[in-house]
Amino acid sequence: YFGKLESKLSVIRNLNDQVLFIDQGNRPLFEDMTDSDCRDNAPRTIFIISMYKDSQPRGMAVTISVKCEKISTLSCENKIISFKEMNPPDNIKDTKSDIIFFQRSVPGHDNKMQFESSSYEGYFLACEKERDLFKLILKKEDELGDRSIMFTVQNED
């Protein structure tokens, strides 16, 4: 069971300091941006991280949403990353959810975060380079210290 607590506005970056944003086709990607670029591209660069109380504490349970024309929430249903047109619900009556991720700091690196799927244990949000693009994917952790599954989260409130 997950019960919604507070939400915060955040900028999410990969370890190359590229900013996560949602393009016009609702596609998540990471791009080099100055702070000015980041502000100019808001709200597509600003993510609503909603925290949830977890009946089985396993890390900080969160949803990740973005509000452009409508609110879309990140899902990893079927191990496929997509943004679904929905508000983060107040309550989720299950121990797993396709929209709940466990946000945890990387051991020894308090400022680096990982997001593990609550539906698929051992699967993490990751940044993958494909052609000249840096995409958001879901990835099974294969090796310790995999930098592709580490992010920084900067609160904008």
Partner: antibody, heavy 121, light 108 residues
Framework: EVQLVQSGTEVKKPGESLKISCKGS????????IGWVRQMPGKGLEWMGF????????RYSPTFQGQVTISADKSFNTAFLQWSSLKASDTAMYYC??????????????WGQGTLVTVSS | EIVMTQSPATLSVSPGERATLSCRAS??????LAWYQQKPGQAPRLFIY???TRATDIPARFSGSGSGTEFTLTISSLQSEDFAVYYC??????????FGQGTRLEIK
């Protein structure tokens, strides 16, 4: 380059077995579903099944369940489609295609070039 | 399963003219619909997803519309390279995806 490369044309007799392959490169193959699609001569596209190479989870179309086997070898970034006993009606072009994630979710965003299978006595 | 029906089966249009291809779902597919183009001897190529969003490098003359059970692919001014077979595909209840039977767009 992001691509799926399929094995070559096959000519087989009815009753024979066959395994065709689809090798992904240029992306994290273990993080995307691969689908198999049949196209019989002069006909449309039919979804056969999916495999997630990261853990070999499979989903089959009811039409093809029990008729074919889909597998993967993640160490070689390769998915396979196999038949234990071919029929003349299996003659078709078979495509593998990647299922989009993040970008183009749930659609087939990258396609292999196709493997033509001909079954004839 | 959701059955997808495309019409017409064949559409004859002159270059420079507008082409409108239709796709109907037997039950709601929401906006979870894609369009693919296939040329002879080639694999299909993704053109439109979520009913109306063009994939990368797809020209602006292609536009998709619709939701629920009725969908349309429109090509505003046909170029010679646009003559091909177009398939719609629903993915609303993935993994149970289904394709339409295709519309052949030919030169008039």
């Amino acid at each position: 380059e992001v691509q799926l490369v399929q094995s070559g044309t096959e000519v087989k007799k009815p009753g024979e077995s066959l395994k065709i392959s689809c090798k992904g490169s240029g992306y994290t193959v273990t993080s995307y579903w691969i689908g198999w699609v049949r196209q019989m001569p002069g006909k449309g596209l039919e979804w056969m099944g999916f495999i997630y190479p990261g853990d070999s989870e499979t989903r089959y179309s009811p039409t093809f369940q029990g008729q074919v086997t889909i597998s993967a070898d993640k160490s070689f970034n390769t998915a396979f489609l196999q038949w234990s006993s071919l029929k003349a009606s299996d003659t078709a072009m078979y495509y593998c295609a990647r299922v989009g994630s993040g970008w183009y979710p749930y659609t087939f965003d990258i396609w292999g070039q196709g493997t033509l299978v001909t079954v004839s006595s | 399963e959701i059955v997808m029906t495309q019409s017409p089966a064949t559409l004859s249009v002159s270059p420079g003219e507008r082409a409108t291809l239709s796709c109907r779902a037997s039950e709601s597919a929401s906006s979870n619909l894609a369009w693919y183009q296939q040329k002879p001897g080639q694999a299909p190529r993704l053109f439109i997803y979520t009913a109306s969003t063009r994939a990368t490098d797809i020209p602006a003359r292609f536009s998709g519309s619709g939701s629920g059970t009725e969908f349309t692919l429109t090509i505003s001014s046909l170029q010679s390279e646009d003559f091909a077979v177009y398939y719609c595909q629903q993915y609303n209840n993935w993994p149970s995806i289904t394709f339409g039977q295709g519309t052949r767009l030919e030169i008039k």
